[in-house]
Interface confidence: low
């Protein structure tokens, strides 16, 4: 019996087609993805093949103005329109709190939303009961397939799930649910979830009875053969894990941003054993036309976005200096503003020993693309912020050794004075450079804001200590020459849309007045 | 003949039990102090020992919502209930002016209230006559003991005693009163007062005829042996001073906030000479039960307070360090929070040339009277803020010349290290001190946030420039020795109530996390 699994993950509000790098579509003839194009491909496969499941492995929420404005209603609406069969909860589904998940998505979705390792307690337990499930048994042709969900146990550090949801260890929580499915004579089981490729592989290895793992969170690109675009494969598609009980378990993920549609064909024997698996992600490029009815619907929903982007978010009473003349050469107040917003967006006070899990921010000055003039009555709009941060990136959470950070700051000024983008803006960091010293040895002082403390204060960076840092995904991926970050990072969790982070902060603060305050000095 | 002296000082409205750091009690099983617990211990000692005096060395007034609401009536009521034998006036007893001392306390207290170095003049002299005394002779068993009071001569700089009270030098004023007691054949004399440990020791050394000194004001903790809590002893208990006429004079103080009950046993010979002294402060921890009748009375009085100020204003995820150990010695994050709130409350963007009319804040560390513990779910209430800023002052706008500000910062550290209140917390100012230099020449760097600029940044202070500064009315009026501000200010506009400024800021910010960020440095 053959099953076709179509899968997406980490779509992050890319409802409209995008450029090849998943930023805003500029030249339509070269654009990719988007739900209208996805629907064309899904429908084509549904018509051609008998047993098809369309699954999403979480993080539909967060990433563009679509989410900012529609707050998840757009996810429910268009996933319903595409007739998804199931979705697993990702960490970003909690970005607007539990209420922001329940009302727009859980109550509106016409497909099951799954997570076996999230347990509700207190008053929330009855309120959320039945709105998400640990698993769902789906009829597919003449057979049934069990889908069991999971979500990163790090979610309390990555989003805002509140105090009434407990995130258990994935493997510990999945095993009893899979066992239950077995007792229900379900012999074909897919683990669909959002914990990252390493955890996906562990689930394949450790959870008895899981036949296929469809994952997300780590934006992993797998491909067999010559990849069709710029993404470099982390392994073959599917990635085969040998389980502890000797089975070959295919693990898949489909990069991110709706650029690809994961396409996995599984052959099961009559007892539900996987006897073959093959496929590849399908690049959703302009050779696939956008479905006209979905496109028309997108255009209708689009109108509200255009109005939103010109509305006032808040005010500035100072010039927000995002000029390259400043931000690539010295501390600039636009850099300070953005870093302050990045930290503010990552407040997760979960432990008495730590005032927060993260206190540091770095931001390549070259990623700041425009100033904002305060002389327009101080008004700041989404449109203004889109000029400052036009690349549609995310502000991510990484774990790095102190020694890696030191290398990053040396790289920041290794060719200082040439107006290059790698000059770092900071938050929760005090750095002093001596440019008279040779490149690679110019950082003479690097103090960082403690986290394991009740009163935040600055201490010298320790080379062997592991630090959490918020930074643009561009830097996490080694951009602007920060290869050491990419090569040496110990953990990487994708975060919220860059503009959204800053706009939320400005809306919260109402009036802003960031200063140049001595975070970066030259001795 | 043996005398037991039980003593408190600097209780500062801690009528209810508190956390170990004397902030609001969070976990009752670990709480300390409070009048109900104090009464249990006092009664236990009164039952067990024949000759007991219960004395208070001043500063019952000011510190929590109890004083804000009841304005001293609570002090009289509960000190009467505990049957104090005498109290010396502290500087804070004048915080609501002389009227605020006379009506609720002096007229209602059933015990003598003492100060030998405060002399009333003008119309006040007849009004206050007999309501406080220079000394009182108390019968104790078959003997009599003279208690002579004194109050910090700095009180006019620290509180609001008005113009009709003269505060004389303690030693000069005490000697004739002690001499008078000697002529009355009182041969056992206790000096009970509120001028700080250094003055207490001087009194022991210089005032002939004083047998014991029971002090306050400097929150001095003395202990013999291993201290029972977090306070680090400044010396042994009692601290023995050899007087100029060769006697060994015990000097005691009992920290502050009602956390300890001072317990001193003195043995006198038949001529009134001290032949032995020993004891220790008793930590009033949860091993001592709260007296049920006093506790019931506290609960009855409490009702009025709960309505007043127990609603959450916002949250903190950091410890708001308002301890005198921090705020009188170095940059503290409570000072930063308050200054940031003061600037935020004074945003008036009226001119393109100026991002704001004012960018600077100074705040005497001594005006920060309590920390706020974040471990109470982060909740901050008006009540919490009233303990931090209990003086009901205002945050005012002044115009000063740069030279005046420089003098103020020199004054800030002119006698650094003595836990005096004039150490300045700041906002919009970066100051560097070199304490190896002589007083008056210790400010080696003073940079201030520009106002006539579109991007706020720090520039060196200019001596001849006129600056606007936000500061407590206490400083504008020359308090804590800042005479230069009072004398040289060019303009003074009174501002908003201090707690209100901070509470509004916290409500606006919702979640706060002020850091120690290098505003104040020592080279």
């Amino acid at each position: 019996w053959e099953l076709t699994i179509l899968h997406t993950n980490d779509v992050h509000s890319r409802l409209e087609q995008t450029s090849e790098d998943s930023s805003k579509c500029v030249n339509a003839s070269r654009c990719m993805g988007g739900v209208a194009r996805l629907f064309t491909k899904v429908q084509q496969i549904r018509r051609a093949e008998p047993n098809v499941l369309l699954l999403d492995a979480g993080d539909q929420y967060q990433g563009t103005i679509w989410f900012t404005v529609y707050k998840g209603a757009e996810v429910a609406h268009f996933m319903n329109a595409l007739r998804y069969d199931a979705m697993a909860l990702g960490n970003h589904e909690f970005d607007n709190g539990v209420e922001g998940l329940i009302e727009p998505l859980l109550k509106e979705a016409k497909f099951p939303i799954l997570s076996a390792n999230i347990k509700a307690k207190g008053p929330l337990a009855s309120q959320i009961s039945g709105l998400y499930l640990p698993y769902k048994v789906l009829p597919v042709g003449d057979e049934v397939v069990g889908i069991v969900g999971y979500t990163s146990k790090e979610t309390p550090f990555l989003s805002n799930p509140g105090t009434n949801l407990v995130f258990e260890d994935e493997i510990t929580a999945l095993q009893p649910e899979v066992d239950k499915l077995k007792t229900l004579n379900v012999n074909k089981i897919i683990a669909l979830g959002h914990s990252g490729f390493e955890t996906d592989k562990l689930i394949a290895q450790k959870v008895r009875g899981v036949d296929v793992v469809v994952g997300g969170h780590s934006n992993t690109f797998l491909y067999t053969g010559n990849p069709p675009s710029k993404e470099v494969p982390a392994g073959k598609y599917p990635f085969i894990v040998t389980s502890d009980d000797g089975r070959k378990v295919p693990v898949v993920q489909a990069y991110a941003f709706g650029k690809y549609l994961g396409y996995l064909k599984i052959e099961f024997d009559e007892r539900g054993n996987v006897i073959s698996s093959h496929g590849n992600p399908i690049l959703l490029n302009s050779s696939i036309p956008e479905d006209p009815s979905i496109k028309a619907d997108i255009n209708k929903w689009r109108i509200k976005l255009d109005n939103y982007s010109t509305q006032e978010l808040g005010k500035t009473i100072v010039y927000l200096d995002g000029s390259s003349q400043s931000c690539r050469f010295r501390e600039c107040n636009m850099g300070n503003l953005i870093c302050d917003a990045m930290i503010n967006n990552n407040l997760r006070h979960a432990d008495e020993m730590f005032w927060n899990h993260v206190s540091m921010c770095i931001l390549n000055g070259g990623g700041i693309r425009s100033p904002i003039d305060e002389r327009n009555n101080g008004t700041i709009t989404w449109e203004n912020l889109a000029a400052v941060l036009p690349f549609g990136g995310t502000f991510d959470l990484v774990q790095l050794k102190g020694s890696t950070l030191k290398k990053a700051f040396e790289h920041s000024v290794h060719r200082y004075g040439q107006s290059t983008g790698e000059f770092l803006q900071v938050g929760g960091i005090h750095v002093v450079y001596d440019l008279s010293r040779k490149p690679g040895d110019r950082v003479v002082k690097l103090d960082v804001l403690c986290t394991k403390c009740r009163v935040p204060s600055y201490d010298p960076l320790k080379m062997d200590e592991i630090y959490k840092v918020i930074l643009p995904n561009f830097l996490a991926n080694g951009g602007d020459g920060f290869q050491m970050i990419k090569d040496e990072l110990l953990r990487h969790d994708s975060g919220d849309q860059d503009i959204n982070v800053v706009s939320t902060y400005i809306s919260k603060m109402k009036v802003i007045y960031p200063a140049v305050e001595g975070r970066i000095k030259f001795s | 003949w043996e005398l037991t002296i039980l003593h408190t000082n600097d209780v500062h409205s801690r009528l209810e039990q508190t956390s170990e750091d004397s902030s609001k009690c969070v976990n009752a099983s670990r709480c300390m102090g409070g009048v109900a617990r104090l009464f249990t211990k006092v009664q236990q000692i009164r039952r067990a020992e024949p000759n007991v005096l219960l004395l208070d060395a001043g500063d019952q007034y000011q510190g929590t919502i109890w004083f804000t609401v009841y304005k001293g009536a609570e002090v009289a009521h509960f000190m009467n209930a505990l049957r104090y034998d005498a109290m010396a006036l502290g500087n804070h007893e004048f915080d609501n002016g002389v009227e605020g001392l006379i009506e609720p306390l002096l007229k209602e207290a059933k015990f003598p209230i003492l100060s030998a170095n405060i002399k009333a003049k003008g119309p006040l002299a007849s009004q206050i006559s007999g309501l406080y005394l220079p000394y009182k002779v108390l019968p104790v068993g078959d003997e009599v003991v003279g208690i002579v009071g004194y109050t910090s001569k700095e009180t006019p700089f620290l509180s609001n005693p008005g113009t009709n009270l003269v505060f004389e030098d303690e030693i000069t004023a005490l000697q004739p009163e002690v001499d008078k007691l000697k002529t009355l054949n009182v041969n056992k004399i206790i000096a009970l007062g509120h001028s700080g440990f250094e003055t207490d020791k001087l009194i022991a050394q210089k005032v002939r005829g004083v047998d014991v000194v029971v002090g306050g004001h400097s929150n001095t903790f003395l202990y013999t042996g291993n201290p029972p809590s977090k306070e680090v002893p400044a010396g042994k208990y009692p601290f023995i001073v050899t007087s100029d006429d060769g006697r060994k004079v015990p000097v005691v103080q009992a920290y502050a906030f009602g956390k300890y009950l001072g317990y001193l046993k003195i043995e006198f010979d038949e001529r009134g000479n001290v032949i032995s002294s020993h004891g220790n402060p008793i930590l009033l921890n949860s091993s001592i039960p709260e007296d049920p009748s006093i506790k019931a009375d506290i609960n009855k009085w409490r009702i009025k307070l709960d309505n007043y100020s127990t609603q959450e204003l916002g949250k903190t995820i950091v410890y708001l360090d308002g301890s005198s150990q921090s705020c009188r010695f170095r940059e503290c994050n409570m000072g930063n929070l308050i200054c940031d709130a003061m600037i935020n409350n004074n945003l008036r963007h009226a001119d393109e040339m100026f991002w704001n009319h004012v960018s600077m804040c100074i705040l005497n560390g001594g005006g920060i009277r309590s920390p706020i513990d974040e471990r109470n779910n982060g909740t901050i209430t008006w009540e919490n803020l009233a303990a931090v800023l209990p003086f009901g002052g205002t945050f005012d706008l002044v115009q000063l010349k740069g030279s005046t500000l420089k003098k103020a910062f020199e004054h800030s550290v002119h006698r650094y290290g003595q836990s005096t209140g004039e150490f300045l917390q700041v906002g919009g100012i970066h100051v560097v001190y070199d304490l190896s230099r002589k007083p008056g020449d210790r400010v080696v760097k003073l940079d201030v946030l520009c106002t006539k600029c579109r991007v706020p940044s720090y520039d060196p202070l200019k001596m001849d420039e006129i600056y606007k500064v936000i500061l407590p009315n206490f400083l504008a009026n020359g308090g804590d020795g800042f005479q230069m501000i009072k004398d040289e200010l060019l303009r003074h506009d009174s501002g908003d109530q201090d707690i209100n400024v901070v509470s509004t800021y916290i409500s606006k910010m919702k979640v706060i996390y002020p850091a120690v960020e290098g505003r104040i440095k020592f080279s």
């Epitope: - | 001119d351 393109e352 040339m353 100026f354 115009q399 006129i466 060019l490 303009r491």
Partner: antibody, heavy 120, light 106 residues
Framework: EIQLQQSGPELVKPGASVKVSCKAS????????MYWVKQSHGKSLEWIGY????????SYNQKFKGKATLTVDKSSSTAYMHLNSLTSEDSAVYYC?????????????WGQGTLVTVSA | DAVMTQTPKFLLVSAGDRVTITCKAS??????VAWYQQKPGQSPKLLIY???NRYTGVPDRFTGSGYGTDFTFTISTVQAEDLAVYFC????????FGAGTKLELK
């Protein structure tokens, strides 16, 4: 050097109007209010009003409302005062003045004055 | 508007004299008071602002004091070049000048 250069003397007939100019140099014109002050012969000084060159906002002494109209031309850094329905009472020296700083109206910089004589 | 009553109208002085001029405000104007000197045929010159602060370049023989309603302007030792008309001005409540005091040689 900060300078305020006023237009020359005017002799006008009763009922006519006159426009006095004040050209500023040596500072950012739009950053400071421009004040106008009247001094009748042998008399004290009277404040007429001021204009904010940045946005053209004006404030007038009640006594001169309807008599004086203040305008600016930002491109030439020039302030103007138009006086209408002139009578002999309007004969005076008129000064433009700029403040010391821009918090208060302490007039540190003055034009040389323009004598307006109203005579039949 | 606060009215500024300036006295005296005239002062006969000799070189070296000490001269005091007073201005009384009809209501409190805090310390929002300035003093000006005007010589014949010239524009006024700012001498004192904020009641007691000497403007740049003004000799220290000129001093001002006062707060609220009563203000004093003093020339400690009159010199020949000080013969002029002196005006007070407030800008706390609208903006008004005193009537002026003329210094003349005896």
């Amino acid at each position: 050097e900060i300078q305020l250069q006023q237009s020359g003397p005017e002799l006008v007939k009763p009922g006519a109007s006159v426009k006095v100019s004040c050209k500023a140099s040596g500072y950012a014109f739009t950053s400071y209010n421009m004040y106008w002050v009247k001094q009748s012969h042998g008399k004290s000084l009277e404040w007429i009003g001021y204009i904010d060159p940045y946005n053209g906002g004006t404030s007038y002494n009640q006594k001169f409302k309807g008599k004086a109209t203040l305008t600016v031309d930002k491109s030439s850094s020039t302030a103007y005062m138009h006086l209408n329905s002139l009578t002999s009472e309007d004969s005076a020296v008129y000064y433009c003045a700029r403040g010391y700083g821009n918090y208060k109206a302490w007039f540190a910089y003055w034009g040389q004055g323009t004598l307006v004589t109203v005579s039949a | 508007d606060a009215v500024m009553t300036q006295t005296p109208k005239f002062l006969l002085v000799s070189a070296g004299d000490r001269v005091t001029i007073t201005c009384k405000a009809s209501q409190s104007v805090t310390n929002d008071v300035a003093w000006y000197q005007q010589k014949p045929g010239q524009s006024p010159k700012l001498l004192i602002y904020y009641a007691s602060n000497r403007y740049t370049g003004v000799p220290d023989r000129f001093t001002g004091s006062g707060y609220g309603t009563d203000f004093t302007f003093t020339i400690s030792t009159v010199q020949a070049e000080d013969l002029a008309v002196y005006f007070c001005q407030q800008d706390y409540s609208s903006l008004t000048f005193g009537a002026g005091t003329k210094l003349e040689l005896k």
